[in-house]
């Protein structure tokens, strides 16, 4: 029950996170004009990954796309790439995790397959979240660098009389959305990985002796397994995730990826 809840919560948290990453990537407010020196500006500038906008006090907003690839800063391109990779990985992770959900029955999919898929989606969410956090952090670092550079030459005198104010940019709402969304996706991924470990049914760890009617053959099996007494639940459809130990009915089953997590 706790595993299902953990898996379900991980899925929901990741879903919210990825939606946030998509929203942040599409948002225009990655950087917004710093109003410290001119709080009563009638023209407000803000920029996104894909276009820059100007909002006038009149209410009129004009946005212009960056219709060039080669002319854009390498850092901006890197941020775009990180965010897109994050979205793609997150989307695939969501798709995989839907089929991995314990509450959803798909044919005769075994728990081991679901555990595998849960782990895969968890790792994807973790990488997706890290991509988003990295992308947003790179952009934020770029902003901080540019902010102090423009502060250094904020006012350039012209004839001693006229001053040209250089527009400075500070953190926009999209950065905070991106950080939070990346964090949520990361947390969701971790929850999926945790859920994966407990996705297999709880097995009683007996280090036991198997007594048979003949009284001759004594089977001692090291490691976690169910004593093969013939009593208890049918083990035919159960797999034990304990570093490769197998029930007698499952001689041909092989350890999965997540055995080593």
């Amino acid at each position: 029950m706790a595993v299902t809840a953990c898996q379900g919560l991980g899925f929901v948290v990741s879903l919210i996170g990825i939606a946030g990453i998509i929203a942040a990537t599409c948002m225009d407010q990655w950087s917004t004009q710093d109003l410290y020196n001119n709080p009563v500006t009638a023209v407000f500038n803000y920029q996104g990954l894909w276009r820059s906008c100007v909002r006038e006090s009149s209410g009129f907003t004009e946005c212009r796309g960056y219709f060039t690839l080669l002319g854009l800063p390498a850092m901006l391109q890197a941020v775009r790439a990180l965010m897109i990779v994050g979205i793609v990985l997150g989307a695939i992770g969501l798709l995989v995790s839907i089929f991995a959900l314990k509450c959803i029955r798909i044919g005769s999919m075994e728990d081991s397959a679901k555990a595998n898929m849960t782990l895969t989606s968890g790792i994807m969410f973790i990488v997706s979240g890290l991509c988003a956090i990295a992308g947003v952090s790179v952009f934020a670092n770029m902003l901080v660098t540019n902010f102090w550079m423009s502060t250094a030459n904020m006012y350039t005198g012209m004839g001693g009389m006229v001053q040209t104010v250089q527009t400075r940019y500070t953190f926009g709402a999209a950065l905070f959305v991106g950080w939070v969304a990346g964090g949520l996706t990361l947390i969701g991924g971790v929850m999926m990985c945790i859920a994966c470990r407990g996705l297999a049914p709880e097995e009683t760890n007996y280090k036991a002796v198997s007594y048979h009617a003949s009284g001759h053959s004594v089977a001692y099996k090291p490691g976690g397994f169910k004593a093969s007494t013939g009593f208890g639940s049918n083990t035919k459809n159960k797999k034990i995730y304990d570093g490769g130990a197998r029930t007698e009915d499952e001689v041909q089953s092989y350890p999965s990826k997540h055995d080593y997590v």
Partner: antibody, heavy 118, light 113 residues
Framework: DVQLVESGGGLVQPGGSLRLSCAAS????????MHWVRQAPGKGLEWVAF????????YYADSVKGRFSISRDNAKNTLFLQMNSLRAEDTAVYYC???????????WGQGTLVTVSS | DVVMTQSPDSLAVSLGERATINCKSS????????????LTWYQQKPGQPPKLLIY???TRESGVPDRFSGSGSGTDFTLTISSLQAEDVAVYYC?????????FGQGTKLEIK
């Protein structure tokens, strides 16, 4: 056709109050920021106050700050200017103007004269 | 506050001749975000409210004759009437529309010589 009609002007004593109105028609009033601009007799134009379309943003000229108050009623398509503690230097023709792209004033009313005199 | 200074205060030009009015701002009115200059020109005839001529320093308002043109960038701007007509007699104002307060120039009175 866009129309802006000011009213409420008149003669008032120094220290007195007056409330100007600007009735708008011919456009979606609630979508536009509005301004009050004044012009003293024989003088140039002086910007007085601004109110955004939803009344979220309001700015005043330093000369009227604390004495004048701009407001609007979008349901009645009307702009207001409440003028308190009036001084002789507030004597002017008061215009309301519509804010358009480029932060320009594309339509102006005919103006209403406010005379502050004892 | 941005101080707007117009020159000359008054100007007399013959009909059909070119009239040029200058406007200088104490701060740059060029917005880096869209590379537009936030300067507006108005025409005011006696007994009438002002009329919008040009915004963004060089964009003519619809209905304004093409003999009116605006130019300049940053802090120095010019309004040019290529061929003066009798109906162009008026006072012309430039206005800072970049930051509040939205200050006006003192005005330039244009007359026929």
């Amino acid at each position: 056709d866009v129309q802006l009609v000011e009213s409420g002007g008149g003669l008032v004593q120094p220290g007195g109050s007056l409330r100007l109105s600007c009735a708008a028609s011919g456009f979606t009033f609630s979508s536009f920021g509005m301004h009050w601009v004044r012009q003293a007799p024989g003088k140039g134009l002086e910007w007085v106050a601004f109110i955004s379309s939803g009344s979220h943003t309001i700015y005043y000229a330093d000369s009227v700050k604390g004495r004048f108050s701009i407001s609007r009623d979008n349901a009645k398509n009307t702009l207001f200017l409440q003028m308190n503690s009036l001084r002789a230097e507030d004597t002017a023709v008061y215009y309301c103007a519509r804010f358009q792209y480029g932060n320009s004033f594309d339509y102006w009313g005919q103006g209403t004269l406010v005379t502050v005199s004892s | 506050d941005v101080v707007m200074t117009q020159s000359p205060d008054s100007l007399a030009v013959s009909l059909g001749e070119r009239a040029t009015i200058n406007c200088k701002s104490s701060q740059s009115l060029l917005n880096s975000g869209n590379q537009k200059n936030y300067l507006t020109w108005y025409q005011q005839k006696p007994g009438q409210p002002p009329k919008l001529l040009i915004y963004w320093a060089s964009t003519r308002e619809s209905g304004v004759p093409d003999r009116f043109s605006g130019s300049g960038s940053g802090t120095d701007f010019t309004l040019t009437i290529s061929s003066l007509q009798a109906e162009d007699v008026a006072v012309y104002y430039c206005q800072n529309t970049y930051s509040f307060p939205l200050t006006f120039g003192q005005g330039t009175k244009l007359e026929i010589k």
